[in-house]
């Protein structure tokens, strides 16, 4: 028996592993139960490199770094193993493999092909009531890339290296309580030996990893504190899970898109004392010149007179006062700004290159879309029309699930909306606001969400440089008003930009992502 | 070609045990269930139970159960058929056949070993 | 478990009659229904799986049709090697079952 601790916070991933099996023993059947209670997940795991997702699009089988081994046929069941319930699930035609899988012989062939090869450098496959056929080579068949949208919806053809998620039948109708198997058929290789799991009544509705012997839960809160224990043949893991309980500050921040206000906040912090520091570095140096401009004016040079003690002649003119040196003066306001802004930019309105990093670096998703990843997309490229439920699906307010360029997504027929649109990505943490399940896809959350809140930067830069300028030019002298350096248009081409990319009623950019997309890391 | 090669026949006393084997080859032995049938002398085929050597699944007969194991060697492409507290009902030639691939509805039997016969005498 | 029963249990036939030997299975299997041949002191022989799919080596005289819980095998012309053992197999479901057997004559 073995015993661990496991202290996190609240809104971070539970990583519950379960002891390994003995090496040379054939992988035991795990049984996750929690707190005293009867089992709520049972698992057969498969070999290395799977995993299964339970959430909103139901149970998911994850396939990691497919390669040329993993094509082939992949069967499933509500059911377990031991029951003959098995249908089609998908077939899985890894490119450059030199093999291609087909339920139908019919989605083998273009027109006038008949049902002969798909290409003269691969070998297709056809699923023959219940183990697959080689079938013959055609003579005249099209090019490969024409044929691939013929297949029907339930034909994968993946790049190697990219992971794919199959469901047991077709969101929303696929399998999402369990139990349920699944088998892979490969007519020439050694099958992949391929997860079963039940999902029992104590099981919690929430999002769920199974990877292997480790049990990972997204997004912990306070309910998932407790003891989970994981039996695997005769050893026990106990697992104690603490969680700390954030502040509701916190819970607020990660409803207003999670690290993008903070991050946001700082960096307009940051442009704010720079702004300042630049303000009065200027006005410094405008001061200097201003009083050295009027000490050595002719027309305005005078000189104090201080009569003599003593002496009843007075003179109007006497002793001439020095002029100040740069050096002179406020040097205490010059020392602070020296150490602030010693790289300060210059009093301007710099939100613009924020804007268009920002921008840039939400364009340069990884994966972003099947069309950029050809052939890596679940469907085949041109099959937009035929799928109900691929990455090349027309409605754009649904995420690709897909990783690495394969996957699935919800039917057409019923489009989620922006509250459904949980992404995926490499970083650490899972946000899931509404607490419902969703795969991962490759897609990074925006740097600058139009959700936020509709602050304008480039307005509170002018008032606070404004306020700073009018507050200190009482303590010192009147001097003409300060003018930007930038001239005006642009500098409010520049604020309106800005607001308009942040506005939270105007038009999604292309670019967004939209909602309120978490990420997570398969890594 | 698909071959299933089992061993020779067995004598044994009543109240012991017997393991017999059958050996593959011609195909890829983990990815085909192994089929176990016995047939009592004069008498028709009785389904045993089967195993799928890529996870060591197995399936039994009910009446089997408690009598009969099914393992399998995947270094050596061999399943066996262990039968435990014997009696003279257990008399029988014991066939095995490969079945269908694991996650499929293959249920028939192409392929058979020549059988081994096993002989529960006092 | 399914209970399959085949009849008659024993047939006796000239070569080159046609022959029908039946199958009935205690509740419906759709056609989940195999057939095998037994020579004396062989091996079982697929002749037919599914009810009535052909098997590649098997000469074109075996037949079979059927589907639910009612099932044939049809031999159209007997010859002398067709002697022996026939079985129906039920593969709809754990435990797979077999029928009694028709015992195959040659007169």
């Known amino acids: 028996q073995k015993l661990l601790q496991v202290e996190m916070e609240e809104g971070s991933d539970a990583v519950l592993p379960c002891l390994q099996d003995p090496p040379d023993g054939p992988p035991e059947r795990l049984i996750w139960s929690r707190d005293s209670q009867g089992p709520f997940l049972e698992l057969s795991p498969g070999s290395p490199g799977l995993g299964i997702h339970v959430g909103r699009l139901g149970i998911l089988l994850l396939i990691f770094n497919v390669s040329n081994e993993m094509g082939g046929f992949y069967l499933c069941q509500p059911a377990p193993p031991s029951q003959q319930a098995w249908q089609p699930g998908w077939t899985v035609s890894v490119e450059g493999s030199g093999e291609l899988f087909r339920w139908n012989a019919s989605d083998l062939g273009g027109p006038g092909c008949g049902l002969g090869n798909e290409s003269s450098s691969s070998q297709p496959y056809v699923w023959d009531r219940d183990h697959p056929k080689e079938w013959d080579m055609g003579p005249a068949c099209a090019s490969p890339r024409g044929d691939l949208n013929q297949s029907s919806s339930l034909d994968l053809t993946v790049a190697p290296g990219s992971t794919v998620w199959l469901s047991c039948g077709v969101p929303p109708a696929s399998v999402a309580t369990g139990p349920v198997s699944w088998a892979h058929i490969h007519p020439t290789k050694p099958n992949i030996l391929l997860p079963s799991l039940n999902l029992t009544a104590e099981s919690p509705a929430r999002e769920m990893w199974v990877l292997g012997p480790v049990l990972m839960l997204p997004q912990v809160t306070a309910v998932d504190a407790g003891m989970y224990v994981c039996r695997r043949g005769n050893l026990t893991t106990e697992i104690h899970v603490t969680i700390t309980v954030r502040p509701a500050i916190w819970h607020w921040l990660q409803r207003k898109s999670g690290w993008i206000v903070p991050v946001v906040a700082l960096l307009y912090l940051i442009f704010c004392l720079g702004c300042l520091v630049s303000f009065l570095h200027l006005r410094r140096a405008l001061i200097l010149r201003r009083k050295r401009k009027r000490m050595t004016d002719p027309t305005r040079r005078f000189f104090k007179v201080t009569p003599p003690a003593g002496n009843g002649a007075q003179s109007q003119y006497g002793n001439v006062l020095s002029l100040p040196t740069p050096t002179s003066g406020t040097g205490r306001a010059q020392r602070w700004a020296a150490s602030l802004g010693g790289a300060a930019a210059p009093y301007g309105h710099p939100l613009s290159d924020v804007q268009e990093a920002g921008a840039a670096g939400s364009r340069s998703l990884p994966r972003a879309s099947p069309e950029e990843e050809e052939g890596e997309a679940y469907e085949e490229p041109d099959s937009e029309a035929d799928s109900e439920f691929y990455e090349n699906d027309s409605n754009p307010a649904q995420d690709q699930l897909s990783q690495d360029g394969s996957g699935y997504e919800n039917p057409e027929e019923e489009p989620s909306g922006p509250e459904d649109d949980d992404s995926f990505s490499n970083a650490e943490s899972y946000e899931n606001e509404d607490e419902e399940l969703a795969p991962p896809v490759t897609r990074t959350a925006d740097f600058l969400s139009p959700h936020g809140s509709a602050w304008d930067p480039s307005r509170e830069a002018v008032s606070l440089g404004s306020q700073s300028y009018e507050d200190m030019r009482g303590i010192l002298y009147a001097a003409p008003q300060l003018r930007s350096s930038r001239p005006g248009p642009s500098y409010e081409e520049d604020a309106d930009s800005y607001e308009n990319m942040d506005n939270p009623d105007g038009p999604e950019p292309a670019w967004g992502a939209g909602g309120h997309g978490g990420t997570w890391s398969t890594r | 070609q698909v071959q299933l090669q089992q061993s020779g026949p067995e004598v044994v006393k009543p109240g012991a045990s017997v393991r017999m084997s059958c050996k593959a080859s011609?195909?890829?032995?983990?990815?085909?269930?192994i089929h176990w049938m016995k047939q009592r002398p004069g008498q028709g085929l009785e389904w045993v139970g089967c195993?799928?050597?890529?996870?060591?699944?197995?399936n039994y007969n009910e009446k089997f159960k408690g009598k009969a194991t099914l393992t399998a060697d995947k270094s050596s492409s061999t399943a066996y058929l262990q039968l435990s507290s014997l009696t003279s009902e257990d008399s029988a030639v014991y066939f095995c056949?490969?079945?269908?691939?694991?996650?499929?509805?293959?249920?028939?039997?192409?392929?058979w070993g020549q059988g081994t016969l096993v002989i529960v005498s006092a | 478990d399914i209970v399959m029963t085949q009849s008659p249990a024993t047939l006796s036939v000239t070569p080159g009659d046609r022959v029908s030997l039946s199958c009935r299975a205690s509740?419906?299997?759709?056609?989940?229904l195999h057939w095998y041949q037994q020579s004396s002191h062989e091996s079982p022989r697929l002749l037919i799986k599914y009810a009535s799919q052909s098997i590649s080596g098997i000469p074109s005289r075996f037949s079979g049709s059927g589907s639910g819980s009612d099932f044939t095998l049809t031999i159209n012309s007997v010859e002398p090697e067709d002697v022996g053992v026939y079985y129906c197999?039920?593969?709809?479901?754990?435990?797979?079952?077999f029928g009694g057997g028709t015992n195959l004559e040659i007169k």
């Open positions: 011609g195909y890829i032995f983990t990815n085909h269930y």
């Open positions: 509740q419906s299997i759709s056609d989940f």
């Open positions: 197999q039920n593969g709809h479901s754990f435990p797979y079952t």
């Open positions: 056949a490969r079945g269908g691939y694991y996650g499929s509805s293959y249920s028939w039997f192409a392929y």
């Open positions: 195993i799928y050597p890529g996870n060591v699944n197995s």
